[in-house]
């Protein structure tokens, strides 16, 4: 018996605007109704939690309101976003997948996606 | 799946001894990172020390006084504590996460990595 496997893309790259979007998979090794998502960053030997949500399966994800994450799940996949990312956050972003319930609790963790964040060269000023 | 069970807390003398073990069912602990943590009342749980196949790791707290070590035959991960002081009074918890490649030292004992907690084992140390 193994860890449950959680797979995410290795790279990211957010956009101009702070917003990184990526996939976490994971494979249920059994009939999970109720999952837990926690989104972790590890940069400079410090891991910090990013953002957590738990839903029930078939049901959509609910962060908490002032979240920088928002998502939605597919079967035994969750589409996760994050935004008002900038370059201090650059790191990498790990998927963490707790199968709560029913009986027996799975953990897996996936092996992270480095995403990158490049601040937006200011506007140079405009004559017209 | 993994199931722990951990056992081994009581009361100490302060400078005395006493050492916790974590038993695995379920599954070799072979791809797992075991670590041991601990709460005192009105704190936060906070790492002891963590152990994967090749490495170990310990809180600043406990270094030289504490030793992780595991069996992977009999799936035992066992936390000997000497010279125990006051402050190391706590609930001890063991826990398991998945070994990943990107767990450094620093960071492979972080609490946010493990799952499978113990219902937790009291420590005292009073004279």
């Known amino acids: 018996c193994k860890a449950m496997h959680v797979a995410q893309p290795a790279v990211v790259l957010a956009s101009s605007r702070g917003i990184a979007s990526f996939v976490c998979e994971y494979a249920s090794p059994g009939k999970a109704t109720e999952v837990r998502v926690t989104v972790l960053r590890q940069a400079d030997s410090q891991v910090t939690e990013v953002c957590a949500a738990t839903y029930m399966m078939g049901n959509e994800l609910t962060f908490l309101d002032d979240s920088i994450c928002t998502g939605t799940s597919s079967g035994n996949q969750v589409n996760l976003t994050i935004q008002g990312l900038r370059a201090m956050d650059t790191g990498l972003y790990i998927c963490k997948v707790e199968l709560m319930y029913p009986p027996p609790y799975y953990l897996g963790i996936g092996n992270g996606t480095q995403i990158y964040v490049i601040d937006p060269e200011p506007c140079p000023d405009s004559d017209f | 799946e993994v199931q722990l069970v951990e056992s081994g807390g009581g009361l100490a003398q302060p400078g005395g001894s006493l050492r916790l073990s974590c038993a695995a069912s379920?599954?070799?602990?072979?791809?797992?990172?075991i670590g041991w943590f601990r709460q005192a009342p009105g704190k936060e749980r906070e790492t002891v020390a963590c152990?994967?196949?090749?490495?170990?790791s310990y809180a600043d707290s406990v270094k030289g006084r504490f030793t992780i070590s595991r069996d992977n035959a009999k799936n035992m991960v066992y936390l000997q504590m000497n010279s125990l002081k006051p402050e190391d009074t706590a609930v001890y918890y063991c826990?398991?996460?998945?070994?990943?490649?990107?767990?450094?030292?620093?960071?492979?004992?972080?609490?946010?990595?493990?799952?499978?907690w113990t219902q937790g084992t009291q420590v005292t140390v009073s004279s």
């Open positions: 152990i994967n196949r090749s490495r170990t």
């Open positions: 379920g599954s070799t602990l072979d791809p797992f990172v």
């Open positions: 826990a398991a996460s998945p070994d990943k490649p990107f767990y450094t030292d620093q960071t492979m004992c972080n609490k946010h990595y493990y799952g499978y």
